[in-house]
C-alpha cells in the first residue's frame, strides 16, 4: 500500500504507523536515493528496486539489517511481541558505527523516544539484549532516570543521541531490526 | 548449530578438587553467559553461578563462594567449573548451560557426572 | 534467595489430556520464569522464557502464563512424548532457583 507522510508536531510519520527518516524537509513518498542520502552511502546497502531488496517495504536497509522505526506507543514488552510479528526483534545495537546510524535516524525525531532490545529483571542484575547475548558498556553508556519515585527503570529508550533506562511500562515508540545474510 | 561439549565423567575422593570443561561451537562464545547447573542423583537441578566469557566476570551462588572457580579460555571457546574441598554430597551431573533470552538456559551440555566417594 | 514451589509435585495423565503445572515464587518476580523439560538421562530442555514466550522449535501446544508470584505452564494436549519432569526457574534475582519439579507420568 502506498506510504503517506503528513506532519506532526514537526516530525515525519507515515500513515500507517511507521517512521523513516527525514529527508532534508521532503515530504513526498521517500525513494530509494532519499533512503540512501539519511545514512552514511558506504554502509548503505544499494538496491535496484524493491523486489531485489533484503527488506521489508517500509524498513530502512543500513549495513546487514533492515530496521523499523515504529511509531505506535507501546509499553517495552509489548514493544517486543510487535517486533516479533513482523518477524523480527527489538534494536540491539552491535557497533559504533550502527550506534551513530540509529543516532542519525532517531535524531529526527527529538521530541520521541524509542524502545531498544535491552532490559534486566532488577538493578542488582546486569542489562542483558532480548536475544540473551552479554551488553557491554564499551559501547554505549545508560543514563540512569532512577529516582526514589521511580526506584526501577528495567528497560531501555533512546531519546536523540542519549541511550537511557525507563519504566517498561511506559508507553514509547520502538526500533524494530531484522537481520539478514548478505 | 549451537553445541557444548562436556568434559567426561570424574571419580573424587573428598577434599579434591575436579575442573569440568565446556567447549563451545556454532556461535560467538563472548556474546553470551555460560552458566553452571548441577543435579543430584534423583535430585532437582541448582544454578551455581554463571561466567561472562567477554570480560571474565563472575557471579556465583553463595552457596558455592570460596570454592568455585569458573573461567574460560576465549582462544579455543572452552568454559571451565572447578570445585573444590569436594564432598560426598557434590556426587552430581554438572551441566553448562548458554545464556538466551530473559536469562534463560536455551543450550545444553550433555553433563559431567562427577563421583565424590572415599 | 527466591524459593520456587511447583505443584502438583506429580500427575497421571492420558495422551491426550490437557495438563496444568503451577509455579509459586516466594516473592514477585515479573514476567521472569522459564519452564524446562527434563526426561530421564538426559538434559533438560527449555520450552518457555519470560513467563510466557515459546522457545523456538517447541510444539505449540505448550504455553505459559503469569506474572509476579504465580505461573502456569499448559499441555494442551499430552502427547506420548510429554511424558517427562517439568522445572521452572526464576531470572529475576541471585542465585536463580528452580522449582522441585512436577513429575508427569502415564496413567
Known amino acids: 500500500t502506498m506510504a503517506i507522510w503528513r506532519s506532526n508536531s514537526g516530525s515525519n510519520t507515515l500513515e500507517n504507523g511507521y517512521f523513516l527518516s527525514r529527508n532534508k524537509e521532503n515530504h513526498s513518498q521517500p525513494t530509494q536515493s532519499s533512503l540512501e542520502d539519511s545514512v552514511t552511502p558506504t554502509k548503505a546497502v544499494k538496491t535496484t528496486g524493491v523486489l531485489s531488496s533484503p527488506c521489508p517495504p517500509n524498513w530502512i536497509i543500513y549495513e546487514k539489517s533492515c530496521y523499523l522505526f515504529s511509531m505506535s506507543l507501546n509499553s517495552w514488552d509489548g514493544s517486543k511481541r510487535q517486533c516479533w510479528q513482523l518477524g523480527s526483534n527489538l534494536l540491539k545495537i552491535d557497533s559504533s558505527n550502527e550506534l551513530g546510524f540509529i543516532v542519525k535516524q532517531v535524531s529526527s525525531q527529538p521530541d520521541n523516544s524509542f524502545w531498544i532490545g535491552l532490559s534486566r529483571p532488577q538493578t542488582e542484575v546486569p542489562w542483558l539484549w532480548e536475544d540473551g547475548s552479554t551488553f557491554s558498556s564499551n559501547l554505549f553508556q545508560i543514563r540512569t532516570t532512577a529516582t526514589q519515585e521511580n526506584p526501577s527503570p528495567n528497560c531501555v529508550w533512546i531519546h536523540v543521541s542519549v541511550i537511557y533506562d525507563q519504566l517498561c511500562s511506559v508507553p514509547s515508540y520502538s526500533i524494530c531490526e531484522k537481520k539478514f545474510s548478505m | 548449530q549451537v553445541q557444548l561439549v562436556q568434559s567426561g565423567a570424574e571419580v573424587k575422593k573428598p577434599g579434591a578438587s575436579v575442573k569440568v570443561s565446556c567447549k563451545a561451537s556454532g556461535y560467538t562464545f563472548t556474546d553470551y553467559y555460560m552458566h553452571w547447573v548441577r543435579q543430584a542423583p534423583g535430585q532437582g537441578l541448582e544454578w551455581m553461578g554463571w561466567i561472562n566469557p567477554n570480560e571474565g566476570d563472575t557471579n556465583y551462588a553463595q552457596k558455592f563462594e570460596g570454592r568455585i572457580t569458573m573461567t574460560r579460555d576465549t582462544s579455543i571457546s572452552t568454559a571451565y567449573m572447578e570445585l573444590s574441598r569436594l564432598r560426598s554430597d557434590d556426587t552430581a551431573v554438572y551441566y553448562c548451560?548458554?545464556?538466551?533470552?530473559?536469562?534463560?538456559?536455551?543450550?545444553w551440555g550433555c553433563g559431567t557426572l562427577v563421583t565424590v566417594s572415599s | 534467595d527466591i524459593q520456587m514451589t511447583q505443584s502438583p509435585s506429580s500427575v497421571s495423565a492420558s495422551v491426550g489430556d490437557r495438563v496444568t503445572i503451577t509455579c509459586r515464587a516466594s516473592q514477585g518476580i515479573s514476567s521472569w520464569l522459564a519452564w524446562y523439560q527434563q526426561k530421564p538421562g538426559k538434559c533438560p530442555k527449555l520450552l518457555i522464557y519470560g513467563a510466557s514466550d515459546l522457545q523456538s522449535g517447541v510444539p505449540s501446544r505448550f504455553s505459559g502464563s503469569g506474572s509476579g508470584t504465580d505461573f502456569t505452564l499448559t499441555i494442551s494436549s499430552l502427547q506420548p512424548e510429554d511424558f517427562a519432569t517439568y522445572y521452572c526457574?526464576?531470572?529475576?534475582?541471585?542465585?536463580?532457583?528452580f522449582g522441585p519439579g512436577t513429575k508427569v507420568d502415564i496413567k
Open positions: 548451560a548458554r545464556n538466551t533470552g530473559a536469562y534463560s538456559f536455551g543450550y
Open positions: 526457574q526464576q531470572a529475576y534475582g541471585f542465585p536463580f532457583t
